[in-house]
Every structure is written in structure tokens, then in C-alpha cells.
């Protein structure tokens, strides 16, 4: 998302001009040497300082086979030392050497920044033989140069186990500034200073930075790259970018949005998933987080009852998952429920309130005055009780559950009976003689089974020996049930 624009007018003299002994061109450069047919260079350059003696890496040849004369030291001819060109242009450069014909199998390799260039490079070596010497021209061409082509290029030639190295040819590819660091989107606290960084490189250097905030330039004079902008604080969202200028033009960074942290929006869509007598499972959809992560949420519960004192119960929970089981509620009650969530800035407003109800609860008290006696003529046990004083929240009585446990000679068996809500007595068949029968009764509503009454025991004798006295639950204050036989 980087846009590039070439500046036509360049008011700032950013580039000092060609260095001595350098070539600044957007054309191909060649030495003034023979070249392959069909390639006509745009410009030709003579070697710089052609008469200068070469003191670099040379090979001193042995005496000739005739043994009569020494050959001159072998060295690459001087060539242009520095080529400056724009990105996407083509370039061709070469090195040349004259090698006495006594040497065989001379090969020239190209190296860039100390590494040999192998493979798919456009390197051509041409030989121009003469009576005594062969002129060798090694050409290296790059089409559509990129910044990565910047570097120091040399030729190497191996001859008689000696290595001859050319002077370096420095290739400098210039182009529009290239960002190495761009401003990043951020969420910031209102009226609090923060920093943005912008860094761009050439060549050419220097690269100058201009900051832009909401389409207005922050600095009207250039700042050297890298540049850190201290924004003194924002009260509303702003968009920042930076412009990087060099002698070739300007590059504009991506625009980044800086958001102001705010309290979250209230949650929406509070829903009831499940209700029991004493709990309600709710979920909600979080509102917008205000550019700051949610920390936690608060579930607010008000009892909807003219007689209640209107107090609000508050349950704190984590922000995720967006679900909470509200516990410790009264049975068969109506509640108004709202949710609020917070981030580092503060609490959201409360969501729209929703109504929810708990279901009927189980009875909270057991049936009263339970009495048990044996009716031997019918071989059954009569049980009587009084209806418990249940609260409204327990719901409507639907019946009773009777537990009777028969114990005899180490054997124990529990049986359960259900009777309707209109009954306050029941008869159960004698299961075992010469045994103890323990009876407990619980009231039942749609909300569940209430607590069982205290146990009442009666002894069932063997056939023929019966006492009709009843057993009953103790009067209040008695420690244990009484067993009468």
C-alpha cells in the first residue's frame, strides 16, 4: 500500500552530485573496447587514468620458453570505478586483460561483495587473439537493476595457480526512498502523548521525512530519517502517514488510523438459556470494546416485586465466555437482568434490561405430625400426616413421596410410594414380619421433592402378636422419634 510519486520540482538540493572518478548515468556504460556485434552502447567511457601504473593483484609470468625475455606483469586494465544509475535501468560493465598466448585455458569469474556470481547471470567473455597476446573482455550486464544489485563487482582470473583481481566497480542503484519502518496503527488513551516512527533509506541519501496528520503537514521543514513523531495527545481518531523524500522523489507510507480508547458500548441481546428454581443461565452479545480489551462484566439482577426493597444484586464475571449462571435466586420469582462490561477506561452502560423468571422450587419443609400404626387384620401399615406449610415459591403441591424401610435380621429393603396431593393418609402392605418399618414422608411440587420428615419406626411382630398403639413423630423439642409396640 505504498504509493510512489516522482517530484518534478526538487526544491531541496539533496544529492551532492557525482563523486570524483564516478559515473552518474541512467545509460549503459562500457569501456571503449571491442564489443560483440549487434550491441551498440549508449555511452562509451575510456578507462580512468589510463597511464597509471597498476600496483594491485598481478601475476608475474615466468621466463618465456626461449628463456630470453621477461613478460610484463599481468593485470586487468582500469575501468570505471563507480556507476550510479536509477532503479529499473539496464547496465553493462566489463573488465579487460591482455594475456600472452603462452597461457592456455584462462577463465574469468565475476564476484560481487566477495561472493562468486554463478548461474543465471548475464556474463559474456570474448577473446580477441593477436600474434603474441589475446585481449579478453569479460562483460557483465544486468537488466532492470534493483537495489539488491548494489555492491562492489570484481573480475578474477586464475593463471598458473596465480589469481589476478581487477579493481572494483561500484554499482549504486538509486531510487525513490524505501521504508524500513512505517507508522503502525495504535489505540491510545485520550489526551495522552504517544510516539510514531518512520524510517526510509535511499540511495540516494539523505532521506527527509515529513509527517502528515489528517492531511495537514505536522512539520513544514524536512527531518532526517529516521524520525520519531511525538503526538501530544488526541481527542478523536486521527490518520497519520509519513512522506519520505530524496533526490529521486517521494514515497508515501501507508496511512495508519490512531483510535481513541473509550468505554465500551453496552452489551446487546441478553438472552435466557435455562431457568431453574434458584438459577438462571444467561448469555449476551458484547458491545464494541472501545478499542480496549474487555476486562470483566457485571450481571445486575433486580427482583420485580412490589414488596421487594428494590435492591440490586451484582455478580461479577469474566468477559469471556459471554455467559453466566446467576445463582442464589428465589424460586418462582420474577427478575429484571442487565449486563455491563468494562475495559481499562471504564464501565459500559447497562444493556437493555430483560425479564426472567425462576421456576417452582421444591418444598422447604416436611409434612407434619406423621403417625404410623399397624392394621393386622388387613396386614398393612396405616400412615397419617398433616400438610406442610409451604411457601408460595415452592409452587403447587402435587403429592407426597413415602419412603418405608424394612429391616430384619441384617436385611434392609427401601420402598417408595407416591400419593396424590389431596391425601393426608396412606396404607402400605406389610413386607416383612418380625421386622422394623421406618417411615419418612416428603412433600412434592413441580419444582421437586422437599425434605423428608424425621423417621418414624414401628415394629411388625410375627403373626398373632399385635399391639395397635401408633407410632408418631415427636412433639417439638423431643430428641428422638418414639417407638410404641
Amino acid at each position: 500500500a505504498i504509493t510512489e510519486a516522482r517530484e518534478e520540482a526538487k526544491p531541496y538540493p539533496l544529492f551532492p552530485g557525482p563523486l570524483p572518478g564516478s559515473l552518474q548515468t541512467d545509460h549503459t556504460s562500457l569501456l571503449s573496447l571491442p564489443h560483440t556485434s549487434g550491441y551498440q552502447p549508449a555511452l562509451m567511457f575510456s578507462p580512468t587514468q589510463p597511464g597509471r601504473p597498476y600496483t594491485g593483484n598481478v601475476a608475474i609470468p615466468r621466463v618465456t620458453s626461449a628463456g630470453s625475455k621477461l613478460l610484463p606483469p599481468l593485470a586487468f586494465k582500469h575501468t570505471v570505478g563507480h556507476i550510479i544509475l536509477s532503479e529499473h535501468k539496464d547496465v553493462k560493465f566489463n573488465c579487460s586483460i591482455s594475456v600472452p598466448n603462452i597461457y592456455q585455458d584462462t577463465t574469468i569469474s565475476w564476484w560481487k561483495d566477495g561472493k562468486e556470481l554463478l548461474g543465471a547471470h548475464h556474463a559474456i567473455t570474448q577473446f580477441y587473439p593477436d600474434d603474441e597476446v589475446t585481449a579478453i573482455i569479460a562483460s557483465f550486464s544486468i537488466t532492470s537493476v534493483q537495489r539488491s544489485d548494489n555492491g562492489s563487482y570484481i573480475c578474477k582470473m586464475k593463471i598458473n595457480n596465480e589469481e589476478i583481481v581487477s579493481d572494483p566497480i561500484y554499482i549504486e542503484v538509486q531510487g525513490l526512498p524505501h521504508f524500513t519502518k512505517q507508522p503502525e496503527s495504535m489505540n491510545v488513551t485520550r489526551n495522552t502523548a504517544f510516539n510514531l516512527t518512520c524510517q526510509a533509506v535511499g540511495p540516494p541519501e539523505p532521506v527527509n521525512i515529513f509527517w502528515v496528520q489528517n492531511s495537514s503537514r505536522v512539520n513544514e521543514q524536512p527531518e532526517k530519517s529516521p524520525s520519531v513523531l511525538t503526538v501530544p495527545g488526541l481527542t478523536e481518531m486521527a490518520v497519520f502517514s509519513c512522506e519520505a523524500h530524496n533526490d529521486k522523489g517521494l514515497t508515501v507510507s501507508k496511512g495508519v488510523q490512531i483510535n481513541i480508547k473509550a468505554i465500551p458500548s453496552p452489551p446487546t441481546e441478553v438472552s435466557i438459556h435455562n431457568s431453574t428454581a434458584h438459577s438462571i443461565l444467561i448469555s449476551w452479545v458484547p458491545g464494541f470494546d472501545g478499542y480496549s480489551p474487555f476486562r470483566n462484566c457485571s450481571v445486575q439482577v433486580k427482583e420485580v416485586d412490589p414488596l421487594s426493597n428494590g435492591s440490586v444484586m451484582i455478580f461479577n464475571t469474566s468477559a469471556s465466555p459471554h455467559m453466566y449462571q446467576i445463582k442464589q435466586l428465589q424460586a418462582l420469582a420474577n427478575y429484571s437482568i442487565g449486563v455491563s462490561c468494562m475495559n481499562e477506561i471504564g464501565w459500559s452502560a447497562v444493556s437493555p434490561w430483560i425479564l426472567a423468571s425462576t421456576t417452582e422450587g421444591a418444598p422447604s419443609v416436611a409434612p407434619l405430625n406423621v403417625t404410623v400404626f399397624l392394621n393386622e387384620s388387613r396386614d398393612n401399615v396405616d400412615i397419617r400426616w398433616m400438610k406442610p406449610l409451604t411457601k408460595r415459591q415452592a409452587g403447587e403441591l402435587v403429592g407426597y413421596r413415602i419412603s418405608h424401610v424394612w429391616q430384619s435380621a441384617g436385611i434392609s429393603k427401601e420402598l417408595l410410594e407416591e400419593v396424590g396431593q389431596n391425601n393426608s393418609r396412606a396404607q402400605i402392605s406389610v413386607q416383612v414380619h418380625n421386622a422394623t418399618c421406618t417411615v419418612r414422608i416428603a412433600a412434592v411440587t413441580k419444582g421437586g421433592v422437599g425434605p423428608f420428615s424425621d423417621p418414624v419406626k414401628i415394629f411388625i411382630p410375627a403373626h398373632g402378636w399385635v399391639d395397635h398403639a401408633p407410632s408418631s413423630t415427636p412433639a417439638p423439642g423431643n430428641a428422638d422419634p418414639v417407638l410404641i409396640i
Epitope: 526544491p11 531541496y12 489526551n191 509527517w211 496528520q213 489528517n214 495537514s216 503537514r217 505536522v218 512539520n219 513544514e220 521543514q221 524536512p222 527531518e223 513523531l229 501530544p232 495527545g233 488526541l234 481527542t235 486521527a238
Partner: antibody, heavy 118, light 106 residues
Framework: QIQLVQSGPELKQPGETVKISCKAS????????VNWVKQAPGKGLKWMGW????????TYAGDFKGRFAFSLESSASTAFLQINNLKNEDMATYFC???????????WGAGTSVTVSS | QIVLSQSPAILSASPGERVTMTCRAN?????MHWYQQKPGSSPKPWIY???NLASGVPARFSASGSGTSYSLTVSRVEAEDAATYYC?????????FGSGTKLEIK
């Protein structure tokens, strides 16, 4: 310490030219733009424009295009305001001010009073 | 261009009083700077970017605002605060000055 030192008061006749200087010290002159602000007697501040000390490019506010010229002598860290063909309404105190980011004028010259009288 | 209106034009207060002056823009701006000028002197930078006190400004001064409405407050006015205060917007070029509020001490 950072300061802007302005030239002394001027007494001119209508039609004449005046050139006011503003010499900066204590910072790199080419890093910050120099702005010019006019204050007529008993009046408020009026921004005249500025000169880019890096490129030398001047920018003039709407009312100050034509007879007004901003210039630089960077080697001397000095900015100049020249008013040609002086008129009576040019009688004022002229301030130079250094501008930092967000167009904040953090350093001001003491002002140069220009009196135009026939 | 953005026009800044300062009110009141003249503000008279007794020492120890709390005073507030406002600067309204006819279009939203990003920041407001404030300068203090005493008679015969050059303006002094006073508040930078809406709410940041310049070096040496007493802590009894504060400023705030956003959008089109900005204000400068002195919590307990002192005699040395007598001056004209100018606002200057940053948001749209040219970055204009307000007409000034003159604070007088009774």
C-alpha cells in the same frame, strides 16, 4: 540558549523600503522555519507567512502577497523581512518566530517597530 | 480559512478568583496553542497542543478542549497574570490566531 535577535526600530516615509533582520542562535538554523507576525498598534497578532530555512522557499499569507519579501542568509543564520513601497497601514511591530511541529511558535524575537510617517 | 473567536474580549477578575476564557473555531481543529503577551513585549508560548503547559508556566493555568471549542482556565488569578492571551489553531492551513482576550486584575 535559543534566541532570535531582531534589528532595531525603523522610521520610514511612505513609499520607502524597509528590511528587518532576525538572527537565530542556539540551534541549527536550517531545521526550523522562520515565521513573521504583524501586530498593529492596539491590535492582535496577524500571521504574515514563513520562509523554509532548508530550501529558502517563502510562503505568504493572503494579505501579504506583493510588497512583502522573505529572504535568508543561511551562513549568518539570519532571516529577513523586506517591505517595499511602505504604506501607513504597515506601521506596526513585526515579530519573527521559530516554528516547531504543529505550527507552534516556541521562540519569538523581541519585535521590530516600523513607523511610517511623512 | 478557519476563524477563531475569543471571548470575552476583556476579562476582569480579582486576585484569587477562578477565570476561564474560550476560543471557538468555525470548523473543527486538531489542537489549540495559547500565547501570553504583556504590553511592550513579544508573545510568550503558553500552552502547547491544547493542554500542555509551556516551560515555566505556573500550574494554576490549565487548558482543554476539542473540535471547535477550547478554553484556558486560571484557577486562582494573580496580579502577574494580567496580559492578553491569544489562541492559535492547528488543523487547517493557514494556522490562524484568535483576536485575543485581555485579562485585567482588579
Amino acid at each position: 540558549q535559543i534566541q532570535l535577535v531582531q534589528s532595531g526600530p525603523e522610521l520610514k516615509q511612505p513609499g520607502e523600503t524597509v528590511k528587518i533582520s532576525c538572527k537565530a542562535s542556539g540551534y541549527t538554523f536550517t531545521d526550523y522555519g522562520v515565521n513573521w507576525v504583524k501586530q498593529a498598534p492596539g491590535k492582535g497578532l496577524k500571521w504574515m507567512g514563513w520562509i523554509n530555512t532548508y530550501s529558502g522557499e517563502p510562503t505568504y499569507a493572503g494579505d501579504f502577497k506583493g510588497r512583502f519579501a522573505f529572504s535568508l542568509e543561511s551562513s549568518a543564520s539570519t532571516a529577513f523581512l523586506q517591505i517595499n513601497n511602505l504604506k501607513n497601514e504597515d506601521m506596526a511591530t513585526y515579530f519573527c518566530a521559530r516554528r516547531v511541529r504543529y505550527w507552534y511558535f516556541d521562540v519569538w524575537g523581541a519585535g521590530t517597530s516600523v513607523t511610517v510617517s511623512s | 480559512q478557519i476563524v477563531l473567536s475569543q471571548s470575552p474580549a476583556i476579562l476582569s477578575a480579582s486576585p484569587g478568583e477562578r477565570v476561564t476564557m474560550t476560543c471557538r473555531a468555525n470548523s473543527s481543529v486538531s489542537y489549540m496553542h495559547w500565547y501570553q503577551q504583556k504590553p511592550g513585549s513579544s508573545p510568550k508560548p503558553w500552552i502547547y497542543a491544547t493542554s500542555n503547559l509551556a516551560s515555566g508556566v505556573p500550574a494554576r493555568f490549565s487548558a482543554s478542549g476539542s473540535g471547535t471549542s477550547y478554553s484556558l482556565t486560571v484557577s486562582r488569578v494573580e496580579a502577574e497574570d494580567a496580559a492578553t492571551y491569544y489562541c492559535q489553531q492547528w488543523g487547517s492551513n493557514p494556522f490562524t490566531f484568535g483576536s485575543g482576550t485581555k485579562l485585567e486584575i482588579k
